[in-house]
Every structure is written in C-alpha cells, then in structure tokens.
Interface confidence: low
C-alpha cells in the first residue's frame, strides 16, 4: 500500500522537517525557521509554539517537533502540553477566584497546587488523633485506645497510611 | 545598538546578477534571522525570503524561487541576497530586516536600504 | 503572489482616532496572531510599530495599537499627529509556501 500510495502521491516521500510544495512540483522543502511537520507527507509545516508570558520553554522547537513549555516560578502546568499556567499558593491555602485563601479549619493542603481537603477522620477508623491537623498537614491516626491496652500484641502490622487525595495536574 | 548596513547603490543590466549584503553589529548575528524584503519606486513593501544564520537554512517567497540565492558569513556577521537575471521590474530598494524566533518573523531592525538599478 | 488588503488611503485631523484595516485569509491573518505593523516615512526604511497582532515593541508609543477579529487585523492611531503622516503596512506570517505577506499599503494624512 505503502509503495503504491508513493507512486500516486510524491508527498508521501517527504520526511518530517519538510513540507511538500506544490508551489515546486511537489519537492520536499525544508520548513523555514519557526515551523516543524512532525510527519512525513505535511503540505505546510506548523509555526512551532510560542513560550512566552508566564510560559517558558522547556524543549526548543525543532524542525521535526513543537516546543514544549512549563511555567515559571510561582506557576504550575495544567491541562494537556501545559496548556495553562495557574498561580502557585503556599502550603495551607488553595486557589480561588479571588486569589490563595487559607485553608478552612478542618482541612489541609500540603502542596502549592490544588485545593483544600479534609483532615482525615481518625475515628472512621477506629482510631485517634495522635498528632493535630494544621492548614498544611494532615492529623495524624495513632492506634486505637485497644491497642494500648495490656497484652496486646506488639507485632501487628500497622495499618497502610492513608495517602492524601492528589488534586488534577 | 543594534545596527544593519547595507551596500550601496548597484546599476545592472538586463540579465545580470546583483549582490548585496547586510553587515549587522550591536547584537549576536546568530540568534536572530535576517528577511530581504524589496520595493519598488511608488510600490509597496515585497517578502523576498528569510534566511537563518546559524546554519544558514533559508526558505523563499514562490515568486524568487530559482532566481534568489541567500548566504551568510558568520565570521564577519554579514548576510547576502544575490538575485540572478535581472530585469527592469526588479528595479528597487532592497532591504534587509532582523526578525526575533519569537515574534511570529516581524522585522524589528531594517537596514538603510539598497538601490538596484535595473536599465539597458 | 498574494497579498493582504489594505484600504489605500486614511486621514484624520490632530488629535483624532483613526483605523487601518488589514484584511487577509485563514491561512494568514486568521490562522496566527502573527500580524504585525510597520510605518514607513517616504524614503525611509520601515519601522516596527506592532507585532504579534497587539504587542509593542519598546519606545513606540501607546497610541498606536492593534487588533484582530477572525481574518481582519487592525492598526488604531489614537490622538493623531503630523508625524504619522505616512505610509502603513500590515504583514503576517502564513501557511502558504511563500511564508511571510504584506499589506498594499495605507498613506495616511494629516489634514
């Protein structure tokens, strides 16, 4: 298929880095600066994407791919390709529409990103709270009052920490 | 600052080949790609081709294509645009413009310009 | 060889607010926000006023500003002076194998 699509369309034999210019009975020409075709066959190459603002670039544009961007300091990657930059908050506050709020009491954030969430409840468990929750950490669940009682066993195996809910990249 | 000289004033004869060159200084010659762009006496600006001088890759307008030849020495931050068989409508200034990767190619900086003189 | 399409001539008194339109395609002034705007006084060489459709470049004064709305770029000189007497040129990177495209042209005038 491949050698017979070939023979009808002379675009095909064009590499990524090029594009197929009707305007040069179909020669395979270089993209210009600033554009890429990242297949074979493109008619036009792509203006390769522009980091700029609160975007930095983390990988140049080439020939053959699109730069890739990140934020810069004080700023965090969202969406698909790093789409959007939003605000860094510092540990115990979250993003809202009018800017970093602390924490509600009751809830925690123990990144820069992400939202507020609830202490985990240590009852829940069967447990108590061994150390207090603040804005930015999690309480945190010591063994139940059985557990301390006499002839308990020493070896049983803690229970798996419960690991805090990761808020969408 | 940031400076492109151009070279003077060129008459040619039909079917003749004109050089000129755009020397720039005031920043680094590689990180920046150089346009020629042309205009003709009472005519608008024209977009010649773009050329790129840290490995000299260039890419023409459809119109120069086979008649534009772009070239660049670095050792001496100059660029060049030859333009082979001449005729009378390639009468014009001439000119060079810088152009920064990340401004969509707008020509920041322009030389002085070139006359070329085309007449039999 | 295409071309975007500028209206020829503009004026307006001192003062005033003018607008210059440039009108390409979707694979020029609507595909990228790569517009920019050049003033060019008679035998000078061009100067960079705008680019990336609304970004000036440092030392051109805020009165001149631009704008785009699908395949329609616009350069807007507000408070007009005799110094901006002179001839306008919009030009925008483009998909087409030619790469790069200029305006017609505007003079405008001071009346």
């Known amino acids: 298929f491949e050698r017979t699509r070939s023979l009808q369309d002379p675009c095909s034999n064009c590499p990524a880095g090029t594009f197929c210019d009707n305007n040069r009975n179909q020669i395979c020409s270089p993209c210009p600066p600033n554009s890429f075709s990242s297949a074979g066959g493109q008619r036009t190459c792509d203006i390769c994407r522009q980091c700029k603002g609160v975007f930095r670039t983390r990988k140049e544009c080439s020939s053959t791919s699109n730069a890739e961007c990140d934020c810069t300091p004080g700023f965090h990657c969202l969406g698909a390709g790093c789409s959007m930059c939003e605000q860094d908050c510092k540990q115990g506050q979250e993003l809202t529409k009018k800017g970093c709020k602390d924490c509600c009491f009751g809830t925690f954030n123990d990144q820069k990103r992400g939202i507020c969430r609830p202490w985990t409840n240590c009852s829940l468990d069967g447990k108590s709270v061994l150390v207090n929750g603040t804005k930015e950490r999690d309480v945190v669940c010591g063994p139940s009052p059985a557990d301390l009682s006499p002839g308990a066993s020493s070896v049983t195996p803690p229970a798996p920490a419960r690991e805090p809910g990761h808020s969408p990249q | 600052q940031v400076q492109l000289v151009q070279s003077g004033a060129e008459v040619k004869k039909p079917g003749a080949s004109v050089k000129v060159s755009c020397k720039a200084s005031?920043?680094?010659?590689?990180?920046?790609?150089m346009h020629w762009v042309r205009q003709a006496p009472g005519q608008g600006l024209e977009w010649m081709g773009i050329?790129?001088?840290?490995?000299?890759?260039?890419s023409y307008a459809q119109k120069f294509q086979g008649r534009v030849t772009m070239t660049r020495d670095t050792s001496t931050s100059t660029v060049y645009m030859e333009l082979s068989s001449l005729r009378s409508e390639d009468t014009a200034v001439y000119y060079c413009?810088?152009?920064?990767?990340?401004?969509?190619?707008?020509?920041?900086?322009w030389g002085q310009g070139t006359l070329v003189t085309v007449s039999s | 060889q295409s071309v975007l399409t500028q209206p020829p001539s503009v004026s307006g008194s001192p003062g005033q607010s003018i607008t210059i339109s440039c009108t390409g395609t979707?694979?020029?002034?609507?595909?990228?926000?790569?517009v920019s705007w050049y003033q060019q006084h008679p035998d000078k060489a061009p100067k960079l006023l705008i680019y990336?459709?609304?970004e000036r470049p440092s030392g051109i004064s805020n009165r001149f500003s631009g704008s785009k709305s699908g395949n329609t770029a616009t350069l807007t000189i507000s408070g007009l002076q005799p110094e901006d007497e002179a001839d306008y040129y919009c030009?925008?990177?483009?998909?087409?194998?030619?790469?790069?495209?200029f305006g017609t042209g505007t003079k405008v005038t001071v009346l």
């Open positions: 005031g920043y680094t010659f590689t990180t920046y790609y």
């Open positions: 030009g925008s990177y483009t998909s087409s194998s030619t790469r790069y495209v």
């Open positions: 990336d459709v609304s």
């Open positions: 979707s694979r020029d002034v609507g595909l990228y926000n790569y």
């Open positions: 413009a810088r152009t920064e990767y990340s401004s969509g190619w707008a020509g920041d900086y």
């Open positions: 050329i790129n001088p840290t490995g000299g890759s260039t």
